[in-house]
Interface confidence: medium
């Protein structure tokens, strides 16, 4: 397997709306049209898929209908946006990237990022 | 049994277009590449066009880019080529190829299956 | 465009001979090289992938070897059911391109 590097901040805050966004920038060696991102998360050494997009360079990512994440990409960069995001989903987001075509295959993981989110506190009851 | 069967060649007027086909069967169509190759009379192997196994990547060879276009339905396990503003010189066999990428990690691309063929011939 | 030049166009031995094929590069292409059989009136077959990787089923009397720039196509002992035209094909970029055929008699 080609290995590639991958960076992508190592903390980020949800915002109080559940939403938490960051950059995914890989080091191209290849000459690949095609990527794969998939966002991976880890908690209590379980790791899980939250989403995955193929995209041709220069054009969006395209995940599926029902994702919580969306994306934009710009040359070897990729703006990853996780929504409805609460406490319990805090963990280790690691953004993995993937040349798909054409050859050869390059692999990148990067280290991840931390994201912290802090579920909103309820409106206290008014008197009014 | 694995299998690419090609159709919807023939006999067609310069400046004219064809469509041709590519039904796939016995593998799993979307997970491969797919080529179409070309070989005119007498001639060697002419690589003509690729496609993704999105179909969102496609590929041509400068002697066909605008005017072919190469195109898939996973959902019909069949490959197309259509062919616009045909001239004498694309005369040829033209071959449906299954890409396989191999090596340990996907490093290298060979067209291990290949159809047997449609013959275009372009004349007035 | 990466030029992929064989030689030679053709040639004649006997049967049991041992039969060799050169394909060039115009470019550094690595080990990104496959060669293709293909008989009169047929589809090519695939031989040998990766440059020397011999495809399942194929007989092992065919080989290949070599990286860069140079390559070679090996029949060790030329046997009546070889008579064909040899192709080399590279996959290091597009455009994807061939040799231009090598092809094999029997004397």
């Known amino acids: 397997c080609k290995a590639m590097h991958v960076a992508q901040p190592a903390v980020v805050l949800a915002s109080s709306r559940g939403i938490a966004s960051f950059v995914c920038e890989y080091a191209s060696p290849g000459k690949a049209t095609e990527v794969r991102v998939t966002v991976l998360r880890q908690a209590d050494s379980q790791v899980t898929e939250v989403c995955a997009a193929t995209y041709m360079m220069g054009n969006e990512l395209t995940f599926l209908d029902d994702s919580i994440c969306t994306g934009t990409s710009s040359g070897n960069q990729v703006n990853l946006t996780i929504q409805g995001l609460r406490a319990m989903d805090t963990g280790l987001y690691i953004c993995k990237v993937e040349l798909m075509y054409p050859p050869p295959y390059y692999l990148g993981i990067g280290n991840g990022t931390q994201i912290y989110v802090i579920d909103p506190e309820p409106c206290p009851d008014s008197d009014f | 049994e694995v299998q690419l069967v090609e159709s919807g060649g023939g006999l067609v007027q310069p400046g004219g277009s064809l469509r041709l086909s590519c039904a796939a069967s016995g593998f799993t169509f979307s997970s491969y590449v797919m080529h179409w190759v070309r070989q005119a009379p007498g001639k060697g192997l002419e690589w003509v066009s690729a496609?993704?196994?999105?179909?969102?990547?496609?590929y041509y060879a400068d002697s066909v880019k605008g005017r072919f276009t190469i195109s898939r339905d996973n959902s019909k396990n069949t490959l197309y080529l259509q062919m616009n503003s045909l001239r004498a010189e694309d005369t040829a066999v033209y071959y449906c190829?299954?890409?396989?990428?191999?090596?340990?990690?996907?490093?290298?691309?060979?067209?291990?299956?290949w159809g047997q063929g449609t013959l275009v011939t372009v004349s007035s | 465009d990466i030029q992929m030049t064989q030689s030679p166009s053709s040639l004649s031995a006997s049967v049991g001979d041992r039969v060799t094929i050169t394909c060039q590069a115009s470019?550094?292409?690595?080990?990104?090289l496959n060669w293709y059989q293909q008989k009169p009136g047929k589809a090519p077959k695939l031989l040998i992938y990766d440059a020397s990787n011999l495809e399942t089923g194929v007989p092992s009397r065919f080989s290949g070897s070599g990286s860069g720039t140079d390559f070679t196509f090996t029949i060790s002992s030329l046997q009546p059911e070889d008579i064909a035209t040899y192709y080399c094909q590279q996959f290091n970029s597009f455009p994807l391109t061939f040799g231009q055929g090598t092809k094999v008699e029997i004397k």
């Open positions: 496609i993704t196994w999105s179909g969102r990547g496609t």
């Open positions: 190829a299954r890409g396989r990428l191999f090596g340990l990690a996907l490093y290298g691309e060979a067209f291990d299956v």
């Open positions: 470019k550094d292409i690595s080990n990104y």
